[in-house]
């Protein structure tokens, strides 16, 4: 029995930040779970982890240097990534593991989300301001 995951096919991070919502075919509220976000076709980089236990506060962390936060809905986890670099444009996969109560459950691999990070384009200020209007 596998949990199904839905995520947007593509997101654009215009301001070097993005909200990626992982929607599950499963209610997480009465479970101990580990939701994670992975970068790359081979999911080699674990970007962010949200650990939940119905009786405790949510734990959110990254062991790979990403600036991330997480929010829990009853059938979703939203990852908020900030300070992304242009070269972190890639495909990102949501993963969910239900640790307790048994049995252990995880998800069918999702299609992933391509996050396209657009660099900040600062408009150069003119060297000489135009004539002021009366």
């Amino acid at each position: 029995n596998k949990i199904l995951v839905k995520q947007s096919p593509m997101l654009v991070a215009y301001d070097n930040a993005v909200n990626l919502s992982c929607k599950y075919s499963y209610n997480l509220f009465s479970r101990e779970f580990r939701a994670s976000l992975h970068k790359g076709l081979d999911s080699a980089v674990e970007v962010c982890v949200v650990y939940g236990n119905y009786s405790q506060q949510l734990q959110v962390y990254s062991k790979t240097g990403f600036n991330c936060d997480g929010k829990l809905g009853n059938e979703s986890v939203t990852f908020y990534l900030q300070n992304l670099y242009v070269n972190q444009t890639d495909i990102y996969f949501c993963k969910i593991e239900v640790m307790y109560p048994p049995p252990y459950l995880d998800n069918e691999k999702s299609n992933g989300t391509i996050i396209h990070v657009k660099g900040k384009h600062l408009c150069p200020s003119p060297l000489f301001p135009g004539p002021s209007k009366p």
Epitope: N1, S25, Y26, N27, L28, F29, S30, R31, Y54, S55, N74, E75, V98, P101, P102, P103, L105
Partner: antibody, heavy 121, light 107 residues
């Protein structure tokens, strides 16, 4: 077809012990939690605890710790509940039931027929 | 531990009437609640899970509602086979306590 077959009625003396069985069939035994529930005459249902045969995980209601012990035999797909130091308060019908996970919401859709335990000298 | 307060304890009604049984908890259980029917000398039968989801094969005259700490089981146009005991049970951690039960009798 999922079936939980419980052992027959027991008449036991005060202070004695009894072992009740719940034999599962029609599904993969190690993939589901089995709950135990007590029903005393004229009273309501009381949750005793659960046992997960896949990893031998157990949860007890604090009220039944020291009274009930849950075990299983995977080879016969059977979960056991041993009750010790029996008193008249333990006279009841005991049910086993399978927990199903409905996409993250739990419930007990399959129940055994119950075992009547009578404690009397 | 979560306390389950089920009311009323007993109810005497006529065939065709509508009844509502309620279950209140002392903390939010996020709809992790089931309802069972039990007839004399029989095993309990699951009617509703996740507070509102009707089990396949259970007549549509049974319905569950509620959220947070307040939940209800409603039976419309009662049939003679509906008489018996009804229990709610939470699954928000352990112990998975049952409500005290409601005895539904024919008037």
């Amino acid at each position: 077809i999922v079936k939980l077959q419980q052992s027959g009625a027991e008449l036991v003396k005060p202070g004695a012990s009894v072992r009740l069985s719940c034999k599962a069939s029609g599904y993969t035994f190690t993939e589901y939690i089995i709950h135990w529930i007590k029903l005393r005459s004229g009273q309501g249902l009381e949750w005793i605890g659960w046992f997960y045969p896949g990893s031998n995980d157990i949860q007890y209601n604090a009220k039944f710790k020291g009274k009930a012990t849950l075990t299983a035999d995977k080879s016969s797909s059977t979960v056991y509940m041993e009750l010790t130091g029996l008193t008249s308060e333990d006279s009841a019908v005991y049910f086993c039931a399978r927990r199903d996970d409905f996409s993250g919401y739990d419930a007990l859709p399959y129940w055994g027929q119950g075992t009547m335990v009578t404690v009397s000298s | 531990d979560i306390q389950m307060t089920q009311s009323p304890a007993s109810l005497s009604v006529s065939v065709g009437e509508t009844v509502t049984i309620t279950c209140r908890t002392n903390e939010n259980i996020y709809s992790n609640l089931a309802w069972y029917q039990q007839k004399q000398g029989k095993s309990p039968q699951l009617l509703i899970y996740a507070a509102t989801h009707l089990v396949e094969g259970v007549p549509s005259r049974f319905s569950g509602s509620g959220s947070g700490t307040q939940y209800s089981l409603k039976i419309t146009s009662l049939q003679s086979e509906d008489f018996g005991n009804y229990y709610c049970q939470h699954f928000w951690g352990t112990p998975c306590t049952f409500g005290g039960g409601t005895k539904l009798e024919i008037k």
